[in-house]
């Protein structure tokens, strides 16, 4: 029986150009975590394997950093990064637990004002 629960950072927002930490935590189970997969919609961003460590998608290696812990740090955020992110915990003997995070990337108000007003 799967007794565990995943706690996530839930719905979060961040500014364009900034960075954000995506964090999930598996609790209420003694199951062994064998691998954690981080996905954005249908795209695999990163894997953290219990034995073999972190693996980052080549498409994201310049903008994704492993950690802290089993979390994932997204850097140099763009508006296109807005959307759903999933942490998928593969465990033994329980099976698979999935957590969902919604990230909204907002236009920086500083950047907007900087573009509109020029100092003569």
């Amino acid at each position: 029986m799967m007794t565990g629960t995943i706690e996530t950072t839930g719905n979060i927002s961040a500014e364009k150009g900034g960075s954000i930490i995506l964090q999930c935590h598996l609790s209420s189970t003694t199951a062994q975590v064998t691998q954690v997969n981080w996905e954005q919609q249908d795209q695999l961003l990163a894997i953290c394997n219990a034995d073999l460590g972190w693996h980052i998608s080549p498409s994201f290696k310049d903008r994704v950093a492993p950690g802290p812990g089993l979390g994932l740090t997204l850097q140099s955020l763009t508006v296109n990064d807005t959307g759903e992110y999933f942490c998928i915990y593969h465990t033994y003997p329980d099976g698979t637990y999935t957590g969902r995070i919604f990230l909204e990337v907002l236009e920086s108000s500083v950047a907007e004002h900087g573009a509109r007003f020029q100092i003569p």
């Epitope: 064998t34 691998q35 997969n37 695999l44 894997i47 394997n49 073999l52 460590g53 693996h55 980052i56 998608s57 080549p58 290696k61 593969h90 698979t96």
Partner: antibody, heavy 117, light 106 residues
Framework: EVQLVQSGAEVKKPGASVKVSCKAS????????IYWLRQAPGQRLEIMGR????????YFVDKFKNRATITTDTSASTAYMELSSLRSEDTAVYYC??????????WGQGTLVTVSS | DIQLTQSPSFLSASVGDRVTITCKGS??????LVWYQQKPGKAPKLLIY???NLQSGVPSRFSGSGSGTEYTLTISSLQPEDFATYYC????????FGQGTKVEIK
């Protein structure tokens, strides 16, 4: 053109150690992890471990944690795998492979290691 | 970790035949499946990644499909150079290989 070239076949006695080399060319050596895998006769390919040439950090599956050592010489773009306390069941073809994200895109040609008394 | 079982283990075929190899996972592989070709004494060669993406330089007669636990590699018209052993590999949970399918000349 990416190439991984391994050292030649070895015959070892039980209890001995073997060190296999893997020379990489055609890409920036520090930008990809190198994995070591093996295939014993009639068995499937199995992963032994990994090294990140950028920082020398190694990772091993449980089965090989106490017997395998993986190192690199970044100046020579070469990875090494040493397996100690050899036994007959270590007779296998040993491969190095470059990982690109989540899968192996280029492999060495394999090195046959025979353990026999 | 996910166990992969390929079928058949051996396959006899003729040049021009359409060949299909199946790879079944013990759990959902989530399309994180790769196919390799290996010839005797040679390094394995990447054919297909992420279930259905053809690696650069691989002939279009090779194709991959599948979802969930079942995946297939298809060679639409077998060529003399295609006689080899084929392996599937998954990375959804652990990093594991199938036992291989040897394609021999009939």
């Amino acid at each position: 053109e990416v190439q991984l070239v391994q050292s030649g076949a070895e015959v070892k006695k039980p209890g001995a150690s073997v060190k296999v080399s893997c020379k990489a060319s055609g890409y920036t050596f520090t930008e990809h992890s190198i994995y070591w895998l093996r295939q014993a006769p009639g068995q499937r390919l199995e992963i032994m471990g990994r090294i990140d040439p950028k920082n020398g950090r190694t990772y091993f599956v449980d089965k090989f944690k106490n017997r395998a050592t993986i190192t690199t010489d970044t100046s020579a773009s070469t990875a090494y795998m040493e397996l100690s306390s050899l036994r007959s069941e270590d007779t296998a073809v040993y491969y190095c492979a470059r990982i690109d994200g989540f899968y192996f895109d280029f492999w060495g040609q394999g090195t046959l290691v025979t353990v026999s008394s | 970790d996910i166990q992969l079982t390929q079928s058949p283990s051996f396959l006899s075929a003729s040049v021009g035949d359409r060949v299909t190899i199946t790879c079944k996972g013990s759990q959902n592989v989530n399309k994180y499946l790769v196919w390799y070709q290996q010839k005797p004494g040679k390094a394995p060669k990447l054919l297909i990644y992420s279930t259905d993406n053809l690696q650069s330089g691989v002939p279009s007669r090779f194709s991959g499909s599948g979802s969930g636990t079942e995946y297939t590699l298809t060679i639409s018209s077998l060529q003399p150079e295609d006689f080899a052993t084929y392996y599937c590999y998954q990375y959804n949970n652990g990093f594991t290989f199938g036992q291989g399918t040897k394609v021999e000349i009939k």
